[in-house]
């Protein structure tokens, strides 16, 4: 595989389940992986009746579906869990749902936060 052109070193981090998992709720995550593996950022969320519930954001290890994607775009039509991934530092800050079958594009803007670095 090898590292991608838009090398990912840091991603926006968020964990809705932070208390149970004993992690920070939000911040920045430094991505780590073997030299021959590509690194990505991801975002995952749920959409219940139009209400967006952010679930996770962070680093994601070598995945063909994320290669050369500069923006975080989920393409599945109506999944239980929405998921997008991308390459490039902090590319998961904003995320979009654009179903392959067509339909309205919805972009989610992050609220302003004071980032904390997670390693």
């Amino acid at each position: 595989s090898g590292r991608g052109e838009a090398e990912t070193r840091e991603c926006i981090y968020y964990n809705a389940n932070w208390e149970l998992e004993r992690t920070n709720q939000s911040g920045l995550e430094r991505c780590e992986g073997e030299q021959d593996k590509r690194l990505h950022c991801y975002a995952s969320w749920r959409n219940s009746s139009g209400t967006i519930e952010l679930v996770k954001k962070g680093c994601w290890l070598d995945d063909f579906n994320c290669y050369d994607r500069q923006e975080c775009v989920a393409t599945e039509e109506n999944p239980q869990v929405y998921f997008c991934c991308c390459e490039g530092n902090f590319c998961n800050e904003r995320f979009t749902h654009l179903p392959e079958a067509g339909g309205p594009e919805v972009t989610y803007e992050p609220p302003p936060t004071a980032p904390t670095l997670l390693t």
């Epitope: 996770k56 962070g58 290890l61 070598d62 995945d63 063909f64």
Partner: antibody
Framework: QLQLQESGPGLVKPSETLSLTCTVS??????????WGWIRQPPGKGLEWIGS???????YYNPSLKSRVTISVDTSKNQFSLKLSSVTAADTAVYYC?????????????WGQGTTVTVSS | DIQMTQSPSSVSASVGDRVTITCRAS??????LAWYQQKPGKAPKLLIY???NLQSGVPSRFSGSGSGTDFTLTISSLQPEDFATYYC?????????FGGGTKVEIK
């Protein structure tokens, strides 16, 4: 309804190459929504992921087998294949092919029935 | 590699019992875990993905929970067809790895 069927020799001699093919019916192997994988299960033991391939030919292998494994896809035949070289008795197992979701976390939702491969002289 | 440890390795239960199987990852895997059921001589069957999402066609008596390193598969009321071996599988890391399995036997 999507079905997967493994085929190949049930007996392979030590040091030779194990070759298996998985034929996909009821759906296209060229779909960008899925990956295709091989998993094995030694007698009385658990599951071991061998590797996965996407329609584009991008492959991922288990590092413990990487030097011996090749997975390839033939979209014209709607098949994907496994080659495992320099086999030993430790490679005796039931070999399964499976369809995996687009992302690894989707899991493997359709499996072949498995084929038993014995490595013995 | 991320090691997945299941407990117990086997459990004896009766029809109607509530059965709980646990899976622990050697490092945090967020919610990216799947559960499979395997009957003797058959291929595994996907039950749950992303820790708690029921795969289409799987009975609602199966449920999954947990995140981080500790996960649980629960069968709320064991049915005769549920006697099988159950495996967990982590997804975020490569290589993909499975737990050693938990065999649910008839008491």
């Amino acid at each position: 309804q999507l079905q997967l069927q493994e085929s190949g020799p049930g007996l392979v001699k030590p040091s030779e190459t194990l070759s298996l093919t998985c034929t996909v019916s009821g759906g296209s192997i060229s779909s960008s929504s899925y990956a295709w994988g091989w998993i094995r299960q030694p007698p009385g033991k658990g599951l071991e992921w061998i590797g996965s391939i996407y329609y584009s030919g991008s492959t991922y292998y288990n590092p413990s087998l990487k030097s011996r494994v090749t997975i390839s896809v033939d979209t014209s035949k709607n098949q994907f294949s496994l080659k495992l070289s320099s086999v030993t008795a430790a490679d005796t197992a039931v070999y399964y092919c499976a369809r995996a979701g687009k992302y690894r976390w989707h899991g493997m939702d359709v499996w072949g029935q498995g084929t038993t491969v014995t490595v013995s002289s | 590699d991320i090691q997945m440890t299941q407990s117990p390795s086997s459990v004896s239960a009766s029809v109607g019992d509530r059965v709980t199987i646990t899976c622990r990852a050697s490092q945090g895997i967020s919610s990216w875990l799947a559960w499979y059921q395997q009957k003797p001589g058959k291929a595994p069957k996907l039950l749950i993905y992303a820790a708690s999402n029921l795969q289409s066609g799987v009975p609602s008596r199966f449920s999954g929970s947990g995140s981080g390193t500790d996960f649980t598969l629960t069968i709320s009321s064991l049915q005769p067809e549920d006697f099988a071996t159950y495996y967990c599988q982590q997804a975020p890391d490569l290589p993909i790895t499975f737990g050693g399995g938990t065999k649910v036997e008839i008491k």
